[in-house]
């Protein structure tokens, strides 16, 4: 049930790897260290996951419970419009850039924030349990 295209969703899946948190049908990894956006993306990909792509406001609200004031990288970038790493547009929340270098997206308990991709931040990975192909 968890197999399929890269951007499908998980259904009822086994438990998550160590240091990953199971929430709903996905596993989430909240980093302790900090990296820039690209390095955070690489970290997630190396673990058969992806930087967090949030599917709707409900998921965002639930995840924010686990967040603090500190911003975390998520799979959101501004390439001629804010888009998630799965290619879908950001359409359930708002994010605005204050400068031309703020092309990567981050989240904290208060919401989304545009940032320069070079800033070292915590990050959140998301995947189906046990490295199934369905990442989002």
């Amino acid at each position: 049930l968890c197999q399929g295209s890269n951007y499908s969703t998980c259904a009822s899946c086994p438990s998550c790897p160590d240091r990953w948190m199971k929430y709903g049908n996905h596993c989430y990894y909240f980093s302790v260290e900090e990296k820039d956006w690209n390095s955070s993306l690489e970290f997630c990909l190396a673990r058969d996951s992806h930087l967090l792509v949030i599917t709707d406001n409900q998921e965002m609200s639930l995840l924010q419970v686990f967040l603090s004031e500190a911003f975390c990288w998520i799979g959101l970038r501004n390439n001629s419009g804010w888009r998630w790493e799965d290619g879908s547009p950001l359409n359930f929340s708002r994010i605005s850039s204050n400068s031309f270098v703020q092309t990567c997206g981050a989240i904290n308990k208060n919401g989304l924030q545009a940032s320069s991709c070079e800033v070292p931040l915590h990050w959140v990975c998301k995947k189906c349990p046990f490295a199934d192909q369905a990442l989002f």
Partner: antibody, heavy 120, light 107 residues
Framework: EVQLVESGGGLVKPGGSLRLSCAAS????????MSWVRQAPGKGLEWVAT????????YYPDSVKGRFTISRDNAKNTLYLQMSSLRAEDTAVYYC?????????????WGQGTLVTVSS | DIQMTQSPSSLSASVGDRVTITCRAS??????LAWYQQKPGKAPKFLIH???TLAEGVPSRFSGSGSGTDFTLTISSLQPEDFATYYC?????????FGQGTKLEIK
């Protein structure tokens, strides 16, 4: 407390060169874009240069492009401005400035400035 | 390049007065505007970003408004320490241009 201390200003002849330094303390230097802003005597503020966190991207207005080079040493918490082919119109107080964080490119913190005089 | 034009270039007012300084952009800059205060012989001090958001520690008598091309900085009740020169600045893209300044003097 954020502190930015500029040095290296002085009198230089037209066509000459000068290197300004800005020592940063009180914050994690390697998390912020940094800039230079200048002010000619009795005049307004003019943005001179901005450098990204890693130093890989630099930005200049046309008035100094090709003559000024901004750089940084994150290990030493120091920002630099190498100025060459100096002209009389480059005479100004040069301020080092830090952005607001996350790439918010307003100038949230300023040094006290260092005076550069270009004159024969 | 975007040009920033401030008015008036100088202004005389008294302690307790309400003062408004205007900054106009040559094209739409949305809310990408900052304000600074500078006293003679001193470095500028950051007051406001994104047209209306007060910097930490800035007194609430300062406020910013506007979007698009027309912006204002308002001081609701002038204090002696507010007499200075004020600059607006476009902060979204290159070049980061400043207004020419407005000098606020004691009447």
């Amino acid at each position: 407390e954020v502190q930015l201390v500029e040095s290296g200003g002085g009198l230089v002849k037209p066509g000459g060169s000068l290197r300004l330094s800005c020592a940063a303390s009180g914050f994690t230097f390697s998390r912020y874009y940094m800039s230079w802003v200048r002010q000619a005597p009795g005049k307004g503020l003019e943005w001179v240069a901005t450098i990204s966190i890693s130093g890989g991207n630099t930005y200049y207005p046309d008035s100094v492009k090709g003559r000024f080079t901004i750089s940084r040493d994150n290990a030493k918490n120091t920002l630099y401005l190498q100025m060459s082919s100096l002209r009389a119109e480059d005479t100004a107080v040069y301020y080092c400035a830090r952005e607001g964080g996350y790439g918010n490119l307003w100038f949230a913190y300023w040094g006290q400035g260092t005076l550069v005089t270009v004159s024969s | 390049d975007i040009q920033m034009t401030q008015s008036p270039s100088s202004l005389s007012a008294s302690v307790g007065d309400r003062v408004t300084i205007t900054c106009r952009a040559s094209e739409n800059i949305y809310s990408a505007l900052a304000w600074y205060q500078q006293k003679p012989g001193k470095a500028p001090k950051f007051l406001i970003h994104s047209a209306k958001t007060l910097a930490e520690g800035v007194p609430s008598r300062f406020s910013g408004s506007g979007s698009g091309t027309d912006f204002t900085l308002t001081i609701s009740s002038l204090q002696p320490e507010d007499f200075a020169t004020y600059y607006c600045q476009y902060h979204y893209g290159i070049p980061f241009t400043f207004g020419q300044g407005t000098k606020l003097e004691i009447k």
